[in-house]
Amino acid sequence: NKILVKQSPMLVAYDNAVNLSCKYSYNLFSREFRASLHKGLDSAVEVCVVYGNYSQQLQVYSKTGFNCDGKLGNESVTFYLQNLYVNQTDIYFCKIEVMYPPPYLDNEKSNGTIIHVKGKHLCPSPLFPGPSKP
């Protein structure tokens, strides 16, 4: 048995940030799971990992330097990505693995989401440093 994953076909990342929701045909409540987001047709780059282990707190990390956070729903994980570059426009795939309780489950490969990064121009001018931060 494989978990089915639904993703938006395309998202536009304005201001270098995007929220990508991965919807699963499986309820993650009270499960030990590893949800991850992968970049590229071959899913070669693991962008972000959200690890859940019964506790209410998710562990989030990236081995590839992406700035990410996550949010858990009963049958979804939403990945929040920041500081994306225009050249990181690509197809991104959601992956899910359920480690406990048995049996181990993972997903059928989804269709992926094309994230089109439309970054703002990041050209600070020292003459106009902008507003102060409280």
Partner: antibody, heavy 120, light 107 residues
């Protein structure tokens, strides 16, 4: 006035445990991501852990991921860091710092720090 | 992870002089760089964020510039209270990282 006050530091033996607290006041604590950053004696700053505003997600530096845990009690305006399996290289001043919900990792206010010494 | 290299390690100057501190990133971090001031026994204090924006209450003599991999903190005219350690920090990539610090000392 924003205030962050750490407590719970001290001398602990290798392999031991400690729990640091950070009491926050002067701002709406539940609106901010909170972090722990440490500074070994005579060295630079190093980010350790973070927790988001509602406590639902956390991240840790690789060097502490399996040993440290971060939590918060928004009703008490308090941030915690549980340090387990302490090693000599964990000896440092531990600072709590806040960051807003948009920048995540930009630390606009810091506490005075709590010294953790790991030695036998 | 991104490595931030600060130079010089120590800067010996007199009050009233101009201080120029450098921070170089091992890869591009856009403008996502902050500068902090730290005095002995005190908490770090945010001076500059997003490479060039002054935090609230920071005097105009502090300015930041740069983008990509090369960044500069300039103190136009050193005041006695400016002698401290200055650290840069990036938030572009995870995990956030700091430079090793530049100590500005009285000559």
């Amino acid at each position: 006035e924003v205030q962050l006050v750490e407590s719970g530091g001290g001398l602990v033996q290798p392999g031991g445990s400690l729990r640091l607290s950070c009491a926050a006041s002067g701002f709406t604590f539940s609106d901010y991501w909170m972090h722990w950053v440490r500074q070994p004696p005579g060295k630079g700053l190093m980010w350790v852990s973070r927790i988001n505003s509602d406590g639902s997600t956390a991240s840790h530096a690789d060097s502490v991921r399996d040993r440290f845990s971060i939590s918060r009690d928004n009703a008490k305006n308090t941030l915690y860091l549980q340090l387990n399996g302490l090693r000599a290289e964990d000896t440092a001043v531990y600072y709590c710092a806040r960051a807003d919900n948009t920048t995540w990792y930009e630390f606009d206010f810091w506490g005075q720090g709590a010294l953790v010494t790991v030695s036998s | 992870e991104i490595v931030l290299t600060q130079s010089p390690a120590t800067l010996s100057l007199s009050p009233g002089e101009r201080a120029t501190l450098s921070c170089r990133a091992s890869q591009s971090i856009s403008i996502y760089l902050a500068w902090y001031q730290q005095k002995p026994g005190q908490a770090p204090r945010l001076l500059i964020f997003d490479a060039s924006k002054r935090a609230t209450g920071i005097p105009a003599r502090f300015s930041g510039s740069g983008s990509g991999t090369d960044f500069t903190l300039t103190i136009s005219s050193l005041e006695p209270e400016d002698f401290a350690v200055y650290s840069c920090q990036q938030r572009h990539n995870w995990p956030p990282t700091f430079g090793q610090g530049t100590k500005v000392e009285i000559k």
